[in-house]
């Protein structure tokens, strides 16, 4: 019995279906086919879970969180024992193993391994201003998304004709910050932060209005 090489890893957007491949060759009839799919979740590597089981001509549910979402892609028994997972969740990320036994065919590689990564587009980030908006001050524009896998990068732009940040601005696209030194009236305006990763983008808006000093009455 020989389980074929798997593609190594699969990426899928949260909520979308995933197919985890596992095929094998065997010299014996499929009368005593036994297939166990297991997962070692990324979130809890010490706690492997059963995903689905085929034994004695019957299918059995695995861990409760997979109930109603998992099945074999084809009619069993078969040499293609790939499974689907519907409505993928972040917690489905992990290393999946198919363990195949088909007595009396023993020997060879009977395990296939596939990694599953569930990707999440960035949630709309939160935009905020840190520091005084008085003319001449330094301000930091902050942008961060609560969700996003892979981790989002952040691009700030000023929504004027150029989309360029003021010349005194420095941007950190990993942290999502823009530091604007010595703000002036020209720093005023609407800024947009774009959070993006491999599968999506989202945005937030921030209105920076630099406060000019009020003229003082002398008298």
């Amino acid at each position: 019995l020989e389980v074929s090489e798997s593609p190594g890893s699969i990426q899928v957007a949260r909520g979308q279906p995933a197919v985890l491949p596992c095929t094998f060759t065997t010299s014996a009839a499929l009368i005593n086919l036994n297939v166990i799919w297991m997962v070692t979740p990324l979130s809890n590597a010490n706690q492997p879970e059963q995903v689905i089981l085929y034994q004695g001509g019957q299918m059995f549910d695995g861990a409760p969180r997979f109930h109603g979402r998992v099945g074999f892609t084809g009619t069993m028994p078969a040499t293609n024992v790939s499974i689907f997972i519907n409505n993928t969740q972040l917690s489905d990320t992990g290393t999946y193993q198919c363990l195949v036994n088909n007595l009396p065919d023993i020997g060879g590689r009977n395990i296939g391994v596939t990694g599953l990564t569930v990707l999440v587009p960035p949630s709309a980030p939160h935009c905020q201003i840190q520091g005084s908006q008085d003319i001449g001050s330094d301000v930091i524009l902050l942008c961060s998304s609560e969700e996003g896998i892979p981790r989002p990068t952040y691009l700030w732009e000023k929504l004027d004709n150029t989309l360029k940040l003021p010349p005194t601005a420095t941007q950190d696209q990993v942290q999502g910050t823009v530091t604007i030194r010595n703000i002036s009236a020209l720093s005023s305006g609407l800024y947009q932060c774009v959070a993006s990763n491999a599968i999506g983008t989202s945005t937030c808006l921030l209105d920076l209005q630099v406060i000019s000093p009020q003229p003082r009455n002398i008298g």
Partner: antibody, heavy 121, light 107 residues
Framework: EVQLLESGGGLVQPGGSLRLSCAAS????????MSWVRQAPGKGLEWVSA????????YYADSVKGRFTISRDNSKNTLYLQMNSLRAEDTAAYYC??????????????WSQGTLVTVSS | DIQMTQSPSSLSASVGDRVTITCRAS??????LNWYQQKPGKAPKLLIY???SLQSGVPSRFSGSGSGTDFTLTISSLQPEDFATYYC?????????FGQGTKVEIK
């Protein structure tokens, strides 16, 4: 009481110009960003343009960029929309709207009653 | 641009009914969502801001919920003055965009 009263609508030929005005009262006009939103007959709402409280920053929808100019006169508590090179698809009721203060840029908390602009030959 | 899709486009209901209107954004907009009511020949009126906050002076039978991409406006017990068109609007990104509207009619 917040009030927004606009004027200047009417019938204009394609390619023509029109200037809408919106007189504001009941709040500190210069402290609020203002906006224009339009609604074609029987259709939904479309944001057109916005301007910061000081008048130093202006924003436009792609559909009007280069043709419309938003401005304000804080001494007169008045918002303007200069519309040039008008097209049939600009036919709509035009509303001026106040934007909520602070971090809520883009929330329209008070609206005018609207003025109809008809572009037709 | 962020697309806003409302459903249904129209509905018929009776006074006292519970009415639910949904709004879906083409990308996550967190809670940067507003709801407006517009009666024929009148200006829109802000009902709900920040997805779930009731604007001052708006009756408590109106409520909003949701975050991310899916949002709901609920009228707990429809009153005669509630027959109107309702619009959602996002302020997460530029340009600001509205849903196409949901017309609530008398059954």
């Amino acid at each position: 009481e917040v009030q927004l009263l606009e004027s200047g609508g009417g019938l204009v030929q394609p390619g023509g110009s029109l200037r809408l005005s919106c007189a504001a009262s009941g709040f500190t006009f210069s402290s609020y960003a203002m906006s224009w939103v339009r609604q074609a007959p029987g259709k939904g709402l479309e944001w057109v343009s916005a301007i910061s409280g000081s008048g130093g920053s202006t924003y436009y929808a792609d559909s009007v960029k280069g043709r419309f100019t938003i401005s304000r006169d804080n001494s007169k508590n008045t918002l303007y929309l200069q519309m040039n090179s008008l097209r049939a698809e600009d036919t709509a009721a035009y509303y001026c709207a106040r934007m909520a203060a602070g971090a809520s840029w883009g929330t329209f908390d008070y609206w005018s009653q609207g003025t109809l602009v008809t572009v037709s030959s | 641009d962020i697309q806003m899709t409302q459903s249904p486009s129209s509905l018929s209901a009776s006074v006292g009914d519970r009415v639910t209107i949904t709004c879906r954004a083409s990308q996550s907009i967190s809670s940067y969502l507003n709801w407006y009511q517009q009666k024929p020949g009148k200006a829109p009126k802000l009902l709900i801001y920040a997805a779930s906050s009731l604007q001052s002076g708006v009756p408590s039978r109106f409520s909003g919920s949701g975050s991310g991409t899916d949002f709901t406006l609920t009228i707990s017990s429809l009153q005669p003055e509630d027959f109107a068109t309702y619009y959602c609007q996002q302020r997460s990104g530029s340009p600001l965009t509205f849903g196409q509207g949901t017309k609530v009619e008398i059954k």
